[in-house]
Protein backbone atom coordinates (compact mmCIF):
# COMPACT_ATOMS: atom_id res chain seq x y z
CA UNK A 1 0.00 0.00 0.00
CA UNK A 2 2.84 2.38 0.93
CA UNK A 3 4.56 1.66 -2.38
CA UNK A 4 1.40 2.54 -4.32
CA UNK A 5 0.98 5.72 -2.29
CA UNK A 6 4.60 6.70 -2.89
CA UNK A 7 4.30 5.98 -6.60
CA UNK A 8 0.97 7.81 -6.93
CA UNK A 9 2.23 10.81 -4.98
CA UNK A 10 5.43 10.87 -7.03
CA UNK A 11 3.36 10.91 -10.20
CA UNK A 12 1.08 13.72 -8.97
CA UNK A 13 4.01 15.84 -7.70
CA UNK A 14 5.84 15.36 -11.01
CA UNK A 15 2.72 16.21 -12.99
CA UNK A 16 2.35 19.49 -11.07
CA UNK A 17 6.07 20.16 -11.52
CA UNK A 18 6.02 19.58 -15.28
CA UNK A 19 2.90 21.74 -15.64
CA UNK A 20 4.86 24.45 -13.78
CA UNK A 21 7.90 24.02 -16.05
CA UNK A 22 5.66 24.42 -19.12
CA UNK A 23 4.02 27.49 -17.54
CA UNK A 24 7.38 29.06 -16.67
CA UNK A 25 8.74 28.44 -20.19
CA UNK A 26 5.72 30.15 -21.74
CA UNK A 27 5.59 33.08 -19.28
CA UNK A 28 6.72 36.54 -20.35
CA UNK A 29 7.95 37.58 -16.90
CA UNK A 30 11.41 36.02 -16.80
CA UNK A 31 12.91 39.43 -16.19
CA UNK A 32 11.02 42.51 -15.10
CA UNK A 33 12.04 46.14 -14.96
CA UNK A 34 13.67 47.01 -11.65
CA UNK A 35 11.44 49.54 -9.91
CA UNK A 36 13.69 50.26 -6.94
CA UNK A 37 14.16 53.94 -7.82
CA UNK A 38 10.71 54.42 -9.37
CA UNK A 39 8.08 52.15 -7.76
CA UNK A 40 5.32 53.42 -10.04
CA UNK A 41 6.23 53.85 -13.67
CA UNK A 42 4.33 55.03 -16.74
CA UNK A 43 6.07 52.41 -18.89
CA UNK A 44 6.87 48.95 -17.51
CA UNK A 45 9.13 46.51 -19.35
CA UNK A 46 9.31 42.77 -18.91
CA UNK A 47 10.86 39.98 -20.96
CA UNK A 48 10.45 36.27 -21.50
CA UNK A 49 12.30 33.57 -23.41
CA UNK A 50 10.28 34.17 -26.55
CA UNK A 51 9.24 37.83 -26.53
CA UNK A 52 9.60 41.14 -24.72
CA UNK A 53 6.65 43.23 -23.57
CA UNK A 54 5.94 46.82 -22.62
CA UNK A 55 2.96 47.71 -20.46
CA UNK A 56 1.87 51.34 -20.52
CA UNK A 57 -0.13 53.30 -17.95
CA UNK A 58 -2.84 53.45 -20.57
CA UNK A 59 -3.42 49.75 -19.94
CA UNK A 60 -2.06 48.68 -23.30
CA UNK A 61 0.53 45.95 -23.50
CA UNK A 62 2.66 45.54 -26.59
CA UNK A 63 4.63 42.33 -27.00
CA UNK A 64 7.24 41.67 -29.64
CA UNK A 65 8.65 38.23 -30.40
CA UNK A 66 12.36 37.67 -30.88
CA UNK A 67 12.04 37.05 -34.60
CA UNK A 68 15.66 36.09 -34.95
CA UNK A 69 17.44 32.90 -34.01
CA UNK A 70 21.04 33.62 -34.88
CA UNK A 71 20.91 37.11 -33.41
CA UNK A 72 19.99 35.89 -29.94
CA UNK A 73 22.64 35.44 -27.23
CA UNK A 74 23.97 31.92 -26.72
CA UNK A 75 22.94 32.00 -23.05
CA UNK A 76 19.31 32.68 -23.95
CA UNK A 77 19.40 29.86 -26.50
CA UNK A 78 20.89 27.56 -23.86
CA UNK A 79 18.12 28.42 -21.39
CA UNK A 80 15.48 27.76 -24.05
CA UNK A 81 17.11 24.41 -24.86
CA UNK A 82 17.30 23.36 -21.20
CA UNK A 83 13.64 24.22 -20.60
CA UNK A 84 12.49 22.39 -23.75
CA UNK A 85 14.57 19.31 -22.91
CA UNK A 86 13.07 19.42 -19.42
CA UNK A 87 9.53 19.57 -20.82
CA UNK A 88 10.14 16.77 -23.36
CA UNK A 89 11.76 14.46 -20.78
CA UNK A 90 9.02 15.26 -18.29
CA UNK A 91 6.27 14.56 -20.82
CA UNK A 92 7.83 11.20 -21.77
CA UNK A 93 8.29 10.45 -18.08
CA UNK A 94 4.62 11.16 -17.43
CA UNK A 95 3.58 8.89 -20.28
CA UNK A 96 5.79 6.07 -19.02
CA UNK A 97 4.72 6.53 -15.40
CA UNK A 98 1.01 6.31 -16.29
CA UNK A 99 1.56 2.72 -17.50
CA UNK A 100 3.82 2.01 -14.53
CA UNK A 101 1.22 2.99 -11.92
CA UNK A 102 0.41 0.01 -9.74
CA UNK A 103 -3.23 1.02 -9.49
CA UNK A 104 -3.64 0.72 -13.26
CA UNK A 105 -3.95 -2.78 -14.74
CA UNK A 106 -2.73 -3.21 -18.33
CA UNK A 107 -3.17 -6.77 -19.55
CA UNK A 108 -0.87 -9.14 -17.73
CA UNK A 109 2.02 -6.73 -17.20
CA UNK A 110 4.58 -8.15 -14.80
CA UNK A 111 5.49 -6.24 -11.66
CA UNK A 112 9.11 -6.35 -12.78
CA UNK A 113 8.12 -4.42 -15.94
CA UNK A 114 6.20 -1.90 -13.82
CA UNK A 115 9.21 -1.52 -11.55
CA UNK A 116 11.49 -0.85 -14.52
CA UNK A 117 9.05 1.67 -15.97
CA UNK A 118 8.71 3.40 -12.60
CA UNK A 119 12.50 3.69 -12.33
CA UNK A 120 12.75 4.97 -15.92
CA UNK A 121 10.10 7.64 -15.36
CA UNK A 122 11.70 8.55 -12.03
CA UNK A 123 15.06 9.13 -13.67
CA UNK A 124 13.36 11.15 -16.44
CA UNK A 125 11.63 13.33 -13.85
CA UNK A 126 14.90 13.89 -11.99
CA UNK A 127 16.71 14.93 -15.19
CA UNK A 128 13.70 17.07 -16.23
CA UNK A 129 13.71 18.87 -12.89
CA UNK A 130 17.46 19.40 -13.04
CA UNK A 131 17.16 20.83 -16.57
CA UNK A 132 14.51 23.32 -15.42
CA UNK A 133 16.49 24.33 -12.33
CA UNK A 134 19.65 24.70 -14.42
CA UNK A 135 17.85 26.76 -17.08
CA UNK A 136 16.29 29.13 -14.57
CA UNK A 137 19.56 29.44 -12.64
CA UNK A 138 21.55 30.26 -15.79
CA UNK A 139 19.02 32.99 -16.65
CA UNK A 140 19.08 34.33 -13.09
CA UNK A 141 22.88 34.48 -13.19
CA UNK A 142 22.64 36.36 -16.49
CA UNK A 143 20.31 38.89 -14.88
CA UNK A 144 22.52 39.38 -11.84
CA UNK A 145 25.54 39.96 -14.08
CA UNK A 146 23.67 42.49 -16.23
CA UNK A 147 22.14 44.22 -13.21
CA UNK A 148 25.51 45.27 -11.91
CA UNK A 149 26.85 46.39 -15.24
CA UNK A 150 27.02 50.14 -14.94
CA UNK A 151 28.18 51.06 -18.46
CA UNK A 152 25.77 53.15 -20.51
CA UNK A 153 25.57 50.64 -23.35
CA UNK A 154 24.87 47.64 -21.19
CA UNK A 155 24.10 44.52 -23.16
CA UNK A 156 20.93 42.95 -21.78
CA UNK A 157 21.35 39.51 -23.21
CA UNK A 158 17.73 39.72 -24.32
CA UNK A 159 17.08 40.02 -28.01
CA UNK A 160 20.38 41.79 -28.61
CA UNK A 161 19.18 45.22 -27.60
CA UNK A 162 21.29 48.06 -26.31
CA UNK A 163 19.76 49.91 -23.42
CA UNK A 164 20.50 52.86 -21.21
CA UNK A 165 21.51 52.42 -17.58
CA UNK A 166 18.14 53.64 -16.31
CA UNK A 167 16.38 50.38 -17.28
CA UNK A 168 17.66 47.53 -15.15
CA UNK A 169 16.03 44.14 -15.01
CA UNK A 170 15.42 41.95 -11.99
CA UNK A 171 13.98 38.47 -11.34
CA UNK A 172 10.54 37.91 -12.82
CA UNK A 173 7.79 35.62 -11.55
CA UNK A 174 8.70 32.94 -14.12
CA UNK A 175 12.04 32.32 -12.38
CA UNK A 176 10.35 31.45 -9.10
CA UNK A 177 7.74 29.33 -10.88
CA UNK A 178 10.58 27.54 -12.68
CA UNK A 179 12.61 26.89 -9.52
CA UNK A 180 9.61 25.55 -7.60
CA UNK A 181 8.38 23.50 -10.57
CA UNK A 182 11.85 22.05 -11.16
CA UNK A 183 12.11 21.16 -7.48
CA UNK A 184 8.72 19.46 -7.49
CA UNK A 185 9.60 17.45 -10.61
CA UNK A 186 12.87 16.41 -8.96
CA UNK A 187 11.10 15.36 -5.75
CA UNK A 188 8.48 13.47 -7.78
CA UNK A 189 11.26 11.65 -9.61
CA UNK A 190 12.97 10.66 -6.38
CA UNK A 191 9.66 9.34 -5.04
CA UNK A 192 9.18 7.26 -8.18
CA UNK A 193 12.66 5.77 -7.78
CA UNK A 194 11.89 4.92 -4.14
CA UNK A 195 8.59 3.34 -5.18
CA UNK A 196 10.44 1.27 -7.79
CA UNK A 197 12.44 -0.49 -5.09
CA UNK A 198 9.25 -1.56 -3.37
CA UNK A 199 7.77 -2.79 -6.62
CA UNK A 200 10.69 -5.06 -7.54
CA UNK A 201 9.69 -8.74 -7.21
CA UNK A 202 12.18 -9.91 -4.60
CA UNK A 203 9.97 -12.49 -2.87
CA UNK A 204 11.15 -16.06 -2.38
CA UNK A 205 8.23 -18.21 -1.31
CA UNK A 206 9.11 -21.69 -0.09
CA UNK A 207 6.36 -24.26 -0.50
CA UNK A 208 5.35 -26.21 2.57
CA UNK A 209 7.14 -29.51 2.97
CA UNK A 210 5.83 -32.36 5.19
CA UNK A 211 8.37 -34.07 7.35
CA UNK A 212 7.37 -37.45 8.69
CA UNK A 213 9.19 -38.29 11.85
CA UNK A 214 9.04 -41.86 13.01
CA UNK A 215 6.25 -42.47 15.43
CA UNK A 216 4.93 -38.97 14.99
CA UNK A 217 2.58 -37.42 12.54
CA UNK A 218 3.58 -33.78 12.69
CA UNK A 219 3.83 -31.57 9.66
CA UNK A 220 6.35 -28.73 9.79
CA UNK A 221 5.40 -25.78 7.58
CA UNK A 222 8.28 -23.37 7.36
CA UNK A 223 5.92 -21.07 5.46
CA UNK A 224 6.73 -18.32 3.05
CA UNK A 225 9.86 -16.57 4.14
CA UNK A 226 9.84 -13.13 2.60
CA UNK A 227 12.88 -11.27 1.40
CA UNK A 228 11.90 -7.80 2.49
CA UNK A 229 13.26 -4.74 0.77
CA UNK A 230 12.60 -2.65 3.79
CA UNK A 231 10.32 -0.31 1.83
CA UNK A 232 6.73 -0.52 2.98
CA UNK A 233 4.40 -3.44 2.85
CA UNK A 234 4.35 -5.82 -0.04
CA UNK A 235 1.13 -5.40 -1.90
CA UNK A 236 1.58 -8.09 -4.51
CA UNK A 237 -1.59 -9.80 -5.67
CA UNK A 238 -3.79 -7.21 -4.01
CA UNK A 239 -5.98 -5.02 -6.15
CA UNK A 240 -5.61 -1.50 -4.89
CA UNK A 241 -7.80 1.52 -5.61
CA UNK A 242 -6.46 4.93 -4.69
CA UNK A 243 -9.78 6.68 -5.00
CA UNK A 244 -8.94 7.91 -8.46
CA UNK A 245 -6.87 10.91 -7.43
CA UNK A 246 -6.87 13.56 -10.14
CA UNK A 247 -4.71 16.58 -10.76
CA UNK A 248 -5.94 19.52 -12.68
CA UNK A 249 -3.33 21.07 -14.91
CA UNK A 250 -4.56 24.64 -14.78
CA UNK A 251 -1.92 27.16 -15.69
CA UNK A 252 -3.49 30.51 -14.95
CA UNK A 253 -2.31 33.61 -16.73
CA UNK A 254 -3.49 37.08 -15.92
CA UNK A 255 -3.68 38.85 -19.23
CA UNK A 256 -3.65 42.59 -19.45
CA UNK A 257 -6.76 44.12 -20.91
CA UNK A 258 -5.03 44.76 -24.21
CA UNK A 259 -2.36 42.37 -25.41
CA UNK A 260 -1.01 43.35 -28.80
CA UNK A 261 1.50 40.96 -30.15
Amino acid sequence: MAVTACQGLGFVVSLIGIAGIIAATCMDQWSTQDLYNNPVTAVFNYQGLWRSCVRESSGFTECRGYFTLLGLPAMLQAVRALMIVGIVLGAIGLLVSIFALKCIRIGSMEDSAKANMTLTSGIMFIVSGLCAIAGVSVFANMLVTNFWMSTANMYTGMGGMVQTVQTRYTFGAALFVGWVAGGLTLIGGVMMCIACRGLAPEETNYKAVSYHASGHSVAYKPGGFKASTGFGSNTKNKKIYDGGARTEDEVQSYPSKHDYV
Epitope: V43, N45, S58, G59, T156, K257
Partner: antibody, heavy 118, light 113 residues
Framework: EVQLQQSGPELVKPGASMKISCKAS????????MNWVKQSHGKNLEWIGL????????SYNQKFKGKATLTVDKSSSTAYMELLSLTSEDSAVYYC???????????WGQGTSVTVSS | DIVMTQSPSSLTVTAGEKVTMSCKSS????????????LTWYQQKPGQPPKLLIY???TRESGVPDRFTGSGSGTDFTLTISSVQAEDLAVYYC?????????FGAGTKLELK
Protein backbone atom coordinates in the same frame (compact mmCIF):
# COMPACT_ATOMS: atom_id res chain seq x y z
CA GLU B 1 -18.42 58.66 -31.09
CA VAL B 2 -16.15 58.99 -28.04
CA GLN B 3 -17.25 61.78 -25.71
CA LEU B 4 -16.18 62.99 -22.29
CA GLN B 5 -18.81 65.25 -20.76
CA GLN B 6 -17.66 67.26 -17.74
CA SER B 7 -19.79 68.99 -15.11
CA GLY B 8 -20.38 72.75 -15.32
CA PRO B 9 -18.33 75.67 -13.95
CA GLU B 10 -18.05 76.10 -10.20
CA LEU B 11 -17.63 79.06 -7.90
CA VAL B 12 -16.53 77.92 -4.45
CA LYS B 13 -15.37 79.50 -1.22
CA PRO B 14 -11.84 79.03 0.13
CA GLY B 15 -11.51 76.00 2.40
CA ALA B 16 -14.44 74.22 0.77
CA SER B 17 -14.29 70.98 -1.21
CA MET B 18 -15.91 70.09 -4.52
CA LYS B 19 -16.32 67.21 -6.94
CA ILE B 20 -16.00 67.38 -10.73
CA SER B 21 -17.57 64.64 -12.83
CA CYS B 22 -16.59 63.31 -16.24
CA LYS B 23 -19.12 61.08 -17.99
CA ALA B 24 -17.67 58.85 -20.69
CA SER B 25 -19.61 57.52 -23.66
CA UNK B 26 -18.90 55.89 -27.03
CA UNK B 27 -16.28 53.41 -25.78
CA UNK B 28 -15.64 50.75 -23.14
CA UNK B 29 -15.13 52.84 -20.00
CA UNK B 30 -13.17 50.17 -18.12
CA UNK B 31 -10.81 49.61 -21.07
CA UNK B 32 -9.00 52.96 -20.86
CA UNK B 33 -7.21 54.85 -18.12
CA MET B 34 -8.64 58.27 -17.24
CA ASN B 35 -6.34 61.24 -16.59
CA TRP B 36 -6.96 64.60 -14.98
CA VAL B 37 -5.10 67.74 -16.02
CA LYS B 38 -5.08 71.26 -14.54
CA GLN B 39 -4.65 74.37 -16.68
CA SER B 40 -3.97 77.60 -14.85
CA HIS B 41 -4.23 81.04 -16.46
CA GLY B 42 -4.96 79.46 -19.83
CA LYS B 43 -1.33 78.41 -20.17
CA ASN B 44 0.44 75.91 -17.88
CA LEU B 45 -0.74 72.32 -18.15
CA GLU B 46 -0.20 70.13 -15.08
CA TRP B 47 -0.91 66.44 -14.80
CA ILE B 48 -2.86 65.69 -11.60
CA GLY B 49 -3.09 61.93 -11.80
CA LEU B 50 -4.78 58.96 -13.41
CA UNK B 51 -7.23 56.23 -12.49
CA UNK B 52 -7.74 52.82 -14.04
CA UNK B 53 -11.54 52.32 -14.12
CA UNK B 54 -11.07 48.56 -14.46
CA UNK B 55 -9.62 48.10 -10.96
CA UNK B 56 -9.74 51.57 -9.40
CA UNK B 57 -5.93 51.79 -9.31
CA UNK B 58 -4.58 55.34 -9.11
CA SER B 59 -1.33 57.25 -9.63
CA TYR B 60 -0.97 60.83 -8.48
CA ASN B 61 1.41 63.66 -9.13
CA GLN B 62 3.05 64.13 -5.71
CA LYS B 63 2.13 67.81 -5.90
CA PHE B 64 -1.59 66.97 -5.90
CA LYS B 65 -1.57 64.23 -3.26
CA GLY B 66 -3.95 65.28 -0.53
CA LYS B 67 -5.44 67.91 -2.82
CA ALA B 68 -7.18 65.67 -5.38
CA THR B 69 -8.93 62.32 -4.96
CA LEU B 70 -9.80 60.30 -8.05
CA THR B 71 -12.68 57.81 -8.13
CA VAL B 72 -14.89 56.10 -10.70
CA ASP B 73 -18.41 54.74 -10.91
CA LYS B 74 -18.35 51.90 -13.40
CA SER B 75 -22.13 51.55 -13.50
CA SER B 76 -22.56 55.07 -14.87
CA SER B 77 -19.22 55.21 -16.74
CA THR B 78 -18.29 58.32 -14.80
CA ALA B 79 -14.94 59.46 -13.39
CA TYR B 80 -14.80 61.89 -10.49
CA MET B 81 -12.18 64.20 -9.08
CA GLU B 82 -12.69 65.65 -5.64
CA LEU B 83 -10.70 68.77 -4.81
CA LEU B 84 -10.11 69.34 -1.10
CA SER B 85 -9.43 72.47 0.99
CA LEU B 86 -9.59 74.84 -1.95
CA THR B 87 -7.50 78.00 -2.13
CA SER B 88 -7.16 80.70 -4.79
CA GLU B 89 -4.21 78.69 -6.20
CA ASP B 90 -6.72 76.00 -7.21
CA SER B 91 -8.62 78.37 -9.50
CA ALA B 92 -8.14 76.83 -12.95
CA VAL B 93 -9.74 74.81 -15.72
CA TYR B 94 -9.71 71.06 -15.01
CA TYR B 95 -9.81 68.51 -17.80
CA CYS B 96 -10.44 64.79 -17.83
CA UNK B 97 -8.73 62.94 -20.68
CA UNK B 98 -8.72 59.37 -21.90
CA UNK B 99 -5.32 57.71 -22.23
CA UNK B 100 -4.46 55.64 -25.28
CA UNK B 101 -1.37 54.17 -27.01
CA UNK B 102 1.91 55.73 -25.99
CA UNK B 103 0.24 57.06 -22.83
CA UNK B 104 -1.10 59.86 -25.02
CA UNK B 105 -4.39 61.55 -24.13
CA UNK B 106 -6.49 61.19 -27.25
CA UNK B 107 -9.89 62.46 -26.06
CA TRP B 108 -10.45 65.36 -23.68
CA GLY B 109 -13.45 66.69 -21.83
CA GLN B 110 -14.54 70.27 -22.53
CA GLY B 111 -13.05 71.36 -19.19
CA THR B 112 -14.55 72.52 -15.89
CA SER B 113 -13.74 76.02 -14.76
CA VAL B 114 -13.25 76.30 -11.00
CA THR B 115 -13.07 79.70 -9.35
CA VAL B 116 -12.15 79.90 -5.68
CA SER B 117 -13.27 83.20 -4.23
CA SER B 118 -14.80 84.49 -1.05
CA ASP C 1 10.62 65.03 -12.27
CA ILE C 2 11.40 65.29 -15.98
CA VAL C 3 11.53 68.92 -17.09
CA MET C 4 10.28 69.70 -20.60
CA THR C 5 11.74 72.81 -22.23
CA GLN C 6 10.07 74.22 -25.35
CA SER C 7 11.52 76.80 -27.69
CA PRO C 8 10.76 79.29 -28.95
CA SER C 9 7.98 80.43 -26.63
CA SER C 10 6.27 82.10 -29.60
CA LEU C 11 6.58 82.05 -33.37
CA THR C 12 5.22 84.57 -35.85
CA VAL C 13 4.71 83.05 -39.28
CA THR C 14 3.06 83.61 -42.61
CA ALA C 15 0.64 81.16 -44.24
CA GLY C 16 2.40 78.48 -46.32
CA GLU C 17 5.63 78.82 -44.38
CA LYS C 18 7.50 75.82 -42.92
CA VAL C 19 7.72 75.91 -39.14
CA THR C 20 9.78 73.89 -36.66
CA MET C 21 9.53 74.01 -32.90
CA SER C 22 11.76 72.28 -30.39
CA CYS C 23 11.18 70.32 -27.19
CA LYS C 24 13.98 69.13 -24.92
CA SER C 25 13.60 66.79 -21.95
CA SER C 26 15.88 66.65 -18.92
CA UNK C 27 16.02 62.83 -19.19
CA UNK C 28 15.82 60.40 -22.08
CA UNK C 29 12.28 59.45 -23.08
CA UNK C 30 13.47 56.45 -25.08
CA UNK C 31 12.18 53.16 -23.69
CA UNK C 32 14.63 50.32 -24.33
CA UNK C 33 11.90 47.68 -24.20
CA UNK C 34 10.26 48.73 -27.46
CA UNK C 35 12.69 51.38 -28.73
CA UNK C 36 9.95 54.02 -28.63
CA UNK C 37 10.18 57.59 -27.43
CA UNK C 38 7.37 58.47 -25.04
CA LEU C 39 6.85 62.04 -26.17
CA THR C 40 3.49 63.49 -27.23
CA TRP C 41 2.58 66.71 -29.04
CA TYR C 42 -0.73 68.54 -28.46
CA GLN C 43 -2.34 71.52 -30.15
CA GLN C 44 -4.58 73.86 -28.15
CA LYS C 45 -6.73 76.59 -29.60
CA PRO C 46 -8.25 79.33 -27.38
CA GLY C 47 -11.25 78.16 -25.36
CA GLN C 48 -10.74 74.53 -26.39
CA PRO C 49 -9.15 71.50 -24.72
CA PRO C 50 -5.81 70.27 -26.07
CA LYS C 51 -5.95 68.05 -29.16
CA LEU C 52 -3.62 65.09 -29.68
CA LEU C 53 -1.37 65.46 -32.73
CA ILE C 54 1.53 63.05 -32.36
CA TYR C 55 2.46 60.27 -29.93
CA UNK C 56 5.56 58.05 -29.62
CA UNK C 57 7.43 61.16 -30.86
CA UNK C 58 6.61 60.52 -34.52
CA THR C 59 3.31 58.61 -34.84
CA ARG C 60 0.59 60.85 -36.23
CA GLU C 61 -2.85 60.51 -34.63
CA SER C 62 -5.58 59.51 -37.06
CA GLY C 63 -7.29 62.52 -38.62
CA VAL C 64 -4.26 64.78 -38.14
CA PRO C 65 -3.10 66.37 -41.44
CA ASP C 66 0.17 65.01 -42.79
CA ARG C 67 1.73 68.47 -42.77
CA PHE C 68 2.39 67.79 -39.05
CA THR C 69 5.54 65.72 -38.50
CA GLY C 70 7.20 64.71 -35.26
CA SER C 71 10.85 63.68 -35.05
CA GLY C 72 13.70 63.24 -32.61
CA SER C 73 14.86 60.72 -30.07
CA GLY C 74 16.17 60.54 -26.52
CA THR C 75 16.03 64.10 -25.21
CA ASP C 76 15.68 66.28 -28.34
CA PHE C 77 12.41 66.44 -30.26
CA THR C 78 10.97 68.57 -33.03
CA LEU C 79 7.49 69.28 -34.36
CA THR C 80 7.44 70.44 -37.98
CA ILE C 81 4.53 71.99 -39.84
CA SER C 82 5.46 71.80 -43.52
CA SER C 83 3.05 74.50 -44.70
CA VAL C 84 1.27 76.51 -42.02
CA GLN C 85 -2.45 77.10 -42.50
CA ALA C 86 -4.58 79.70 -40.74
CA GLU C 87 -6.27 76.96 -38.67
CA ASP C 88 -2.87 75.90 -37.28
CA LEU C 89 -2.57 79.05 -35.19
CA ALA C 90 -2.58 77.72 -31.65
CA VAL C 91 -0.34 76.82 -28.72
CA TYR C 92 1.65 73.59 -29.12
CA TYR C 93 2.63 71.55 -26.06
CA CYS C 94 4.99 68.61 -25.75
CA UNK C 95 4.53 66.10 -22.97
CA UNK C 96 6.66 63.47 -21.25
CA UNK C 97 4.69 60.21 -21.22
CA UNK C 98 7.58 58.08 -20.02
CA UNK C 99 7.93 58.79 -16.33
CA UNK C 100 5.63 59.92 -13.51
CA UNK C 101 4.67 62.59 -12.97
CA UNK C 102 3.75 63.15 -16.61
CA UNK C 103 4.98 66.65 -17.41
CA PHE C 104 4.19 69.26 -20.08
CA GLY C 105 6.33 71.89 -21.71
CA ALA C 106 5.40 75.57 -21.32
CA GLY C 107 4.17 75.64 -24.92
CA THR C 108 5.04 77.34 -28.19
CA LYS C 109 2.52 79.91 -29.41
CA LEU C 110 2.09 80.06 -33.18
CA GLU C 111 0.91 83.48 -34.38
CA LEU C 112 0.14 84.90 -37.81
CA LYS C 113 2.14 87.83 -39.17
Amino acid sequence: EVQLQQSGPELVKPGASMKISCKASGYSFTGYTMNWVKQSHGKNLEWIGLINPYNGGTSYNQKFKGKATLTVDKSSSTAYMELLSLTSEDSAVYYCARMNYGNAMDYWGQGTSVTVSS
Amino acid sequence: DIVMTQSPSSLTVTAGEKVTMSCKSSQSLLNSGNQKNYLTWYQQKPGQPPKLLIYWASTRESGVPDRFTGSGSGTDFTLTISSVQAEDLAVYYCQNDYSYPLTFGAGTKLELK
